[in-house]
């Protein structure tokens, strides 16, 4: 070909390349510009899809090669661009030109049945000429050129039942067929390209033609009489046997229902197994060999679905007789209970009676039964059973604290037939006996200051007991009778704890470094048990503020939650408070009306200073000023944001006398008036009345100020809502209230 372009142009030869060339590279042709007269140095470039991969050009000569085998069926046309460059100038000598490489077709594809192998279904007994299916082959060759892709269909296998249309590939039935005779036909169809001419490729497809079922056959029992057996020990619902009426049809056309036509005693029933189409004869009532040894029933099988077109083939049902023999059975002994629950107290002597199990042989009342215990290899034998009468006894005393329940398995065996064995579980509960004395719940390190005053709490103690801790389990604490110690007293808190108090003063490390207090702890078991536990009290050298200087100084400080720095701060506060309280005592007799009921004995010995005056918005949310206007001070539950306030605590001697509440009333009234009248003054909401002590608390008072002994008006029900961590606290407060009420 020659392309003229203003007296300049491209010259090339071939632009066709046959597909499927087997050489590693195939010369397609040569690009050449007519300006290339041999005097110039021209470089030829190939551009476009396929350049450099499918097609390679020798840029020096313009020769184009196909370096891959080409497949027209994959791609039949390549559009490429050519460029010629003068080596001397590096410029294109003429415009880029587009050219086409066509891949020419060869008959290299066989016809293909892409959807094969084919499976078709046609109902049995269909009339002649019924279309079964259509097969279609495709040929990858060029359908627009020649006969490479033109196909003809023919039947290779399948006569005389089927035929195929040569051009369309439609398969038809040529005769009526019965599925019960043959349900599947293999038909082979051939497709040939080149319209069947010489050199044609062909392909075959197998068509599996299935004949679908129609209900043209009734059910049929194989026998007129069936024999079945049933054991007399068979429970109601037992399958006695299965019957099958055969139907040469399939699927729902073979589906049938079974009925019992004659069974006056109504002992047997029949159900249809939808999966297997069997009739399952089941026991509706227990049979007894001794009363009736043979039963006879009449069973009918009826097709569930009838096809109107084949009614003439009917009736679609069949009948048979089933004779059922009752088989005598030897049953194992039967325990009176499936499982037994027995009780025995712990500690009882070996050979004590636990309980009795009983089993009997239903087949023969005279037959004796032998009892035994199934012994686990790893278990200690704690029980034995009388093999004749089933009584279970202990083989050694039991300890509830080791195991509160024992599970054993007993067996009953027929003496005349040892193979007949039955089992029963026996659950033995070991009942608690108060056989453990109470003891301290932990080791106590107790200290007392040399300058301690009488009535000072030095230790709280509690006890534990290994016995069954029922809800009403109680411990009582007292000093052992043997001691004549006048130094300490034990106060039982009535809540399974006790407080150790100083009875006198004047302790001296020089005289006596340790005191050994024998504490008697009594439980409320039956009979009650006591134990004596020794509490060691160490005498400590303390300063006037009851701060231990020796005797594990650090540990003691830690126990009251104070660092040295905190102690200094507390002492400073103490001086201020002393001045304040002296002033209150001086004026005390002037006022007799009380805001709080005063009980001196309720005063505690700890002073706690709460430095949280006037917290602004934080406090406004936390306090209700209206509470200050009421005579009875109520504790209302209000949410308060978490405010960390430093609480300084220090021990000091009990004042033994409470301040006059009238002074407080006057003080509150003045401050309240000031807050109500002067808008510049912040709400006077920092008065905090600590008149409510948790008397049930083991920790004792937080405050050394006197407390209102009557907090009956308080409602502690909200504590219950605080969840499991506060369960014990809630129990203490709510139970206290209920006992008061």
């Amino acid at each position: 070909d020659y392309k003229d372009d203003d007296d300049k142009g491209w010259v090339w030869n071939q632009f066709f390349v046959p597909e499927e060339m087997n050489t590693t590279s195939h010369h397609i042709g040569q690009l050449r510009s007519d300006l290339d007269n041999g005097n110039n140095s021209f470089q030829y470039k190939l551009l476009g899809a396929g350049a450099g991969s499918t097609f390679i050009i020798d840029e020096r000569t313009g020769d184009i090669y196909a370096i891959q085998k080409l497949d027209r069926e994959e791609r039949s046309l390549y559009i490429l661009r050519a460029q010629v460059i003068d080596i001397a100038t590096g410029r294109a000598v003429e415009p880029e030109s587009e050219f086409v490489i066509k891949v020419s077709d060869i008959n290299d594809h066989e016809p293909q049945f892409l959807d094969g192998p084919y499976v078709a279904t046609v109902p049995e007994m269909s009339p002649e000429g019924t279309s079964v299916t259509q097969v279609t082959a495709t040929d990858g060759d060029d359908p627009s050129y020649g006969n490479n892709a033109r196909l003809l269909y023919s039947l290779i296998q399948g006569q005389p039942y089927f035929s195929v249309e040569p051009k369309t590939g439609v398969i038809r039935m040529t005769s009526q067929m019965d599925r019960e005779t043959k349900d599947q036909y293999l038909v082979v169809i051939q497709a040939k390209d080149m319209v069947g001419q010489a050199g044609a490729f062909s392909a075959t497809a197998t068509v599996t033609i299935n004949l679908s079922d129609v209900n043209d056959n009734p059910p049929k029992f194989q026998q007129r009489l069936y024999y079945l057996n049933v054991s007399e020990e068979a429970p109601v619902g037992t399958t006695v046997g299965r019957l099958l009426a055969e139907d040469s049809d399939i699927g729902e056309n073979a589906a049938m229902n079974y009925f019992i036509e004659e069974d006056s005693s109504d002992v047997f029933g029949i159900i249809t197994d939808r999966e297997t189409q069997e009739g399952i004869i089941i026991l509706k009532k227990r049979v007894d060999y001794e009363s009736k040894r043979k039963h006879s029933v009449r069973v009918k099988a009826v097709n569930r679905y009838i096809d109107d077109r084949f009614l003439k083939e009917g009736p679609f049902e069949d009948i048979t007789i089933v004779q059922i023999s009752v088989v005598d059975a030897d049953e194992p002994p039967v325990f009176t209970l499936e499982s037994y629950v027995m009780e025995i107290a712990e500690g009882v002597v070996s050979g004590s009676l636990v309980g009795t199990v009983s089993a009997r042989d239903l087949d023969n009342d005279d037959s004796s039964v032998r009892y035994s215990i199934v012994q686990g290899l790893h278990l200690k034998r704690l029980f034995s059973i009388n093999e004749h009468n089933g009584t279970i006894i202990t083989t050694e005393p039991l300890d509830r604290e080791k195991a509160s329940w024992h599970n054993i398995t007993v067996t009953a065996t027929e003496t005349r037939n040892p193979e007949k064995i039955s089992e029963a579980n026996v659950y033995i509960q070991v009942l608690d006996v108060n056989d453990h004395a109470p003891e301290f719940s932990k080791y106590y390190e107790t200290f007392v200051c040399e300058n301690a005053v009488p009535g000072q709490l030095i230790q709280n103690i509690s006890a534990v007991d290994k016995d069954d801790s029922a809800e009403n389990h109680r411990f009582y604490f007292s000093l052992a009778q043997a001691t004549n110690s006048s130094h300490f007293t034990v106060k039982d808190n009535q809540d399974n704890t006790a407080g150790i108090f100083t009875a006198g003063s004047g302790f001296s490390r020089k005289e006596q470094f340790y005191f050994f207090l024998p504490i008697l702890i009594l439980d409320n078991g039956s009979p009650p048990l006591t134990s004596t536990n020794t509490l060691t009290v160490t005498v400590c050298d303390c300063d006037t503020e009851v701060n231990t200087l020796y005797c594990r100084y650090g540990a003691f400080l830690y126990s009251i939650g104070l660092s040295t720095e905190a102690l200094v701060a507390v002492l400073a506060c103490l001086l201020i408070l002393l001045v304040f309280f002296l002033a209150i005592i001086g004026i005390r007799q002037q006022r007799k009306k009380t805001l709080f009921s005063e009980k001196v004995e309720e005063f505690r010995e700890n002073i706690v200073r709460y430095d949280d005056e006037g917290g602004g918005e934080e406090d406004t949310e936390a306090f209700d000023i209206s509470a200050l206007r009421t005579r009875a001070v109520l504790r209302t539950h209000k949410p308060r944001k978490k405010i960390t306030t430093e609480i300084h605590s220090l021990y000091r001697q009990s004042l033994q006398v409470g301040p006059d509440s009238a002074i407080f009333r006057q003080f509150i009234s003045e401050k309240l008036e000031e807050a109500n009248t002067d808008p510049s003054v912040p709400p006077y909401d920092s008065l905090q009345t600590y008149a409510f002590e948790g008397t049930g608390s083991l920790a004792g008072s937080l405050s050394s100020l006197g407390s209102n002994t009557s907090d009956v008006d308080q409602n502690y029900e909200y504590l219950v809502g605080w969840g499991p961590p506060f369960k014990q606290l809630a129990g203490m407060y709510t139970s206290q209230r209920s006992t008061r009420d």
């Epitope: 140095s41 470089q43 390679i56 020798d58 020096r60 000569t61 370096i67 080596i87 001397a88």
Partner: antibody, heavy 122, light 108 residues
Framework: QVQLQESGPGLVKPSETLSLTCTVS????????WSWIRQPPGKGLEWIGY???????NYNPSLKSRVTISVDTSKNQFSLKLSSVTAADTALYYC????????????????WGQGTMVTVSS | DIVLTQSPGTLSLSPGERATLSCRAS???????LAWYQQKPGQAPRLLIS???SRATGIPDRFSGSGSGTDFTLTISRLEPEDFAVYYC?????????FGQGTRLEMK
Amino acid sequence: QVQLQESGPGLVKPSETLSLTCTVSGGSINSYYWSWIRQPPGKGLEWIGYIYYIGSTNYNPSLKSRVTISVDTSKNQFSLKLSSVTAADTALYYCARDSRYRSGWYDAFDIWGQGTMVTVSS
Amino acid sequence: DIVLTQSPGTLSLSPGERATLSCRASQSVAGSYLAWYQQKPGQAPRLLISGASSRATGIPDRFSGSGSGTDFTLTISRLEPEDFAVYYCQQYGKSPITFGQGTRLEMK
């Protein structure tokens, strides 16, 4: 490292065909141009022709009528056939690689074989 | 065909001296596609310079090439004993590829 090794008979009778093979080792023959160059004893170098790995060839016009260069990519070899030889064809024959990678204009010969001496004599 | 003429035919110099080899083309060499080779007795030629001035891999920098069109030069700035050999120029700007007749550089 790519190496070239020429092989073939050292003696060829006049009028017969000279056949030489160059084996490429240490690299692929693909994507390069491969040339034959000869050097008569005591004389200068003469380019005979090249073959591109796809089979494209270009020969020196002075020898074009007698020369055939072919390639066997599967063996990583290319060959020279020079027909109707005379004594003037006696020379040291070199195979060399054009340093141009992939198709493009000519380039210098960066890799050479050690050469094989062919004598044309009866 | 492009004819390449090298001069001088023989150049006698001592080690350490500067050598200048000339190559003249009968017509302009397109794209300065000119190369220089060194050949020692019993060895194949070794590429020194391509594209008139680009040193081949591993070639010492004492070798340099210059020129364009028809006149090209190979310069060895300071001769080493191993530099004494025959030097060929080659053009590849136009087919057929041609070589010069060579310049023998010998030790004085």
